[in-house]
């Protein structure tokens, strides 16, 4: 049978002769060379040589464990003479014993990572692992142990992990950003004589909102003219926040001060500045100086680092209301005045007032705006204001002037405004009343006395406040002897009636009826008009048939007394 | 006087890709936020994305229904800003209007002409 | 997301008519972030009322904007032929929102 054990080599031989692996042996062997021993598999003829008379295994190359550990091959022994084995072919195992020659080496060259700042001592930043190509399973050759080179005292590294935790307190991202920390791998278990390999961890120490908004400054001062609509900019300010993104967002508000209502603030979502804006219409003769207290908070603020103080700075802001010269501004927004339509020329009907609204109260002239008046019926004291008439009036012909009165500051023409006036003409009794249209009748020549032929109606252009009340008569040289009679209804109409029985056209064809309209205003108006009666010839049913022709012809044309 | 003038509109078939520019004058380039918005025919409006201003890292965001598609960037050097569409659908085609906020970075002040811009095969 | 619904969604009105269009946000937000344009046929929508009450640059004193919340209101005091267009408004939180718009005809 076989005589061996299982060999072992140690790796990494640097001698100058061939390595001494072991003895491939029988004891069928009698040491006479009769016996002859033949090698195969792994390596066989080449990393590993057999002398085929004792037996002797020797390697020719230096090994490397790491590359191969174990190396499998066949033994036989044959006689040499009959060439047949003397013991079965078996497989034996050449073992490759570690040595450590083999430092640990990173999963990465340069690891990145991140922590808060701020952050409580030990907390985990990452992870860092060397791997060491030597036998785990013999000696300490594979045993790693971290250590820190570079980053204490801000970092430590756990030696049997590789797990890096902070480990200083209250580190600064405002004060520090980056680190470079340099960790160290050591096998041997870290002792004396073990082989070591190094990497680089880059530390960012990421933001927590630490730190307040803080003013630059204490007061700011912002000039804006009063015109300044709402929704205007007038100033821009800035508190400083030494966080990043989210956590130096600002928010602004005016939380005191006179322009509290008066003024806004806003924060430039992108400057992160505050807008100081306009809220109301500003006066400069009211308010001058308006001063507000500003605030600049963070809206997201970390509980545990309130202890460091409120999260927001104030700032007062001093906003000077500027003077704009502005033009003239009247008592009213309109005026509306009255006058009689018999006034006289240069009779005064009102007045307007405007002030210059600004400081130096500038003085103001007037003047009527002639394309309001285009035929000068009104003028207006250019000191004073007052109103008064250059034409006579007619509330007849109008009965509202509307024009417009323009006040102008002496020392600054530019600045004017314009107010309308409504003047109403006020009517007086200076109109007779009038026919309502030209009447023109006709009496049948078998008429019967008292027999209503024609109602009369008036007209008048004046307007009494209490109304109309006309009254109607016969002119005085018609009413003796008259072939006719007025009845006055007492109701603004009169009715003309036959004063006898039948009338003959032949005799007179036409009578002409002057009559008077009276009003009963004061001072009493009169007119007369004249009504005309034709004379004509009737069916039995009083419907005309036929008149005289020269009335149709000349239907006004004069003739008798009627 | 703000100015934005939109360019590089066109018909293009579905599936294809667009860029369009938006030439900015009369202001301070830097300092604002700037948005695209689309009009599609006959319909209302629609914002298609936003990119902020160099501190805040040019930060992009944009409507659902064009992420991933579209990409908004812009160069400060030469007041521009840019429209990239890719993969573009039927139901892109509108007008692209290219817009700048008021003060203060609120709302959309100031409006170019619209630039049209036709998906379909 | 922040959903804007205007109502509504169109009137017919005249001239010298009082008008109020609403829009009302799914959550609330503040007044800052709210806004109204007016856009025209063929025309670039312009800036009629930024952060909810305040007129833009040119914009006549009959508009006015109120609210706060989740309800705000432009208002027309009283409506000229140059108003005849269409309105939204607009919230300022990523992703922006408009609202539907309000189409304002003439009766």
């Known amino acids: 049978s076989w005589m061996w054990n299982q060999f072992f080599l140690l790796e990494e031989y640097t001698g100058s002769d061939y390595q001494y692996v072991g003895k491939l042996h029988s004891d069928q062997d009698r040491g006479d060379g009769s016996l002859k021993y033949i090698l195969s598999g792994d390596g066989a003829g080449d990393l590993f040589i057999i002398n085929e008379n004792t037996g002797d295994i020797q390697a020719t190359k230096r090994l490397d464990r790491e590359e191969k550990p174990v190396y499998i091959l066949r033994a036989q022994a044959i006689n040499r003479r009959t060439g047949r084995p003397v013991e079965p072919e078996s497989e034996f195992i050449i073992k490759i014993h570690d040595i450590n020659d083999n430092e640990p080496i990173f999963t990465k060259e340069v690891y990145t990572a991140t922590v808060p700042e701020m952050s409580d001592v030990g907390t985990f930043v990452v992870q860092v692992t060397a791997t060491d190509a030597d036998d785990p399973t013999y000696g300490n050759s594979a045993k790693v142990v971290y250590s820190i080179l570079q980053g204490q005292p801000y970092f430590s590294v756990e030696s049997e992990t590789g797990i890096i935790k902070t480990a200083l307190l209250n580190m600064d991202r405002e004060n520090r950003e980056q680190y470079q920390v340099v960790i160290q791998a050591k096998d041997m278990g870290g002792q004396m004589g073990g082989l070591s390999g190094t990497t680089t961890v880059n530390i960012t120490l990421t933001d927590v909102n630490d730190n307040p908004p803080r003013f630059p400054q204490s007061t700011y001062q912002f000039k804006t003219p009063e015109s300044s609509p709402p929704g205007t900019p007038i100033g821009r300010i800035k508190a400083s926040d030494a966080d990043v993104g989210e956590n130096a967002e600002i928010e602004y508000s005016i939380t005191d001060g006179e322009g509290l209502d008066m003024f806004d603030v806003i924060t430039d979502q992108e400057t992160q500045e505050g807008i100081i804006t306009v809220k109301k219409l500003l006066d400069f003769e009211k308010k001058k100086v308006y001063t507000l207290k500003v605030e600049a908070s963070n809206p997201y603020v970390e509980p545990r680092f309130l202890y460091l103080g409120p999260f927001k700075d104030s700032a007062t802001v001093r906003i000077v209301v500027e003077d704009v010269d502005e033009p003239p501004v009247f008592s009213k927004l309109a005026y509306i005045l009255q006058i009689r339509e018999d006034a006289q020329i240069n009779t005064t009907i009102g007045s307007v007032t405007a002030q210059d609204p600004d400081a130096a109260r500038n003085p103001v002239k007037y003047s009527v705006d002639r394309h309001t008046d285009m035929d000068r019926i009104f003028n207006i004291d250019s000191g004073n204001g007052s109103i008064f008439t250059s034409k006579l009036l007619d509330r007849e012909t109008l009965l509202w002037h509307n024009i417009t009165v323009i006040a102008t500051e002496i020392n600054n023409p530019k600045q004017s405004s314009r107010v309308p006036l409504y003047i109403k003409v006020l009517d007086v009794n200076d109109n007779a009343p009038e026919f309502a249209e030209f009447y023109e009748t006709f009496v049948c020549e078998k008429a019967k006395a008292d027999q209503l032929i024609q109602t009369l109606h008036a007209v008048d252009k004046d307007d009494p406040y209490s109304g109309h009340q006309f009254s109607f008569s016969l002119a005085p040289e018609a009413a003796s002897g008259s072939n006719f009679t007025i009845q006055d209804n007492k109701d603004n109409t009169a009715g003309i009636l036959t004063r006898k029985n039948g009338y003959n056209r032949h005799e007179m064809s036409t009578y002409l009826l002057p009559v008077v309209i009276s009003d009963n205003d004061y001072p009493v108006q009169s007119s007369t008009g004249t009504v005309t009666v034709r004379v004509c010839a009737c069916d039995h049913h009083g419907n005309m048939q036929s008149c005289h022709a020269e009335a149709l012809i000349h239907p006004t044309g004069l003739s008798t007394g009627a | 006087e703000v100015q934005l003038v939109e360019s590089g509109g066109g018909l293009v078939q579905p599936g294809g890709s667009l860029r369009l520019s938006c030439a900015a004058s009369g202001f301070t380039f830097t300092t604002y936020a700037m948005n695209w918005v689309r009009q599609a025919p006959g319909k209302g409006l629609e914002w298609v994305g936003r990119?902020?201003?160099?501190?805040?890292?040019?930060?992009?965001y944009y409507a659902d229904s064009v992420t991933d598609r579209f990409t908004i960037s812009r160069d400060d050097s030469k007041n521009s800003l840019y429209l990239q569409m890719n993969s573009l659908k039927t139901e892109d085609t509108a007008v692209y209007y290219c817009?700048?906020?008021?003060?203060?970075?609120?709302?959309?002040?100031?409006w170019g002409q619209g630039t049209l811009v036709t998906v379909s095969s | 997301d922040i959903q804007l619904t205007q109502s509504p969604s169109s009137l017919s009105a005249s001239v010298g008519d009082r008008v109020t269009i609403t829009c009302s946000a799914s959550?609330?937000?503040?007044?800052?972030?709210l806004h109204w344009y007016q856009q025209k046929p063929g025309k670039s929508p312009k800036l009629l009322i930024y952060?909810?009450?305040y007129l833009a640059s040119g914009v006549p004193l009959r508009f006015s904007g109120s609210g706060s919340g989740t309800d705000f209101t432009l208002t027309i005091s009283s409506l000229q032929p140059e108003d005849f267009a269409t309105y939204y408004c607009?919230?300022?939180?990523?992703?922006?929102?408009f609202g539907q718009g309000t189409k304002l005809e003439i009766k």
């Open positions: 817009v700048r906020p008021d003060y203060g970075n609120y709302g959309l002040a100031y």
């Open positions: 959550s609330s937000i503040s007044s800052h972030y």
């Open positions: 607009q919230q300022d939180i990523v992703p922006l929102t």
């Open positions: 952060r909810s009450f």
């Open positions: 990119i902020r201003i160099k501190n805040n890292n040019y930060a992009t």
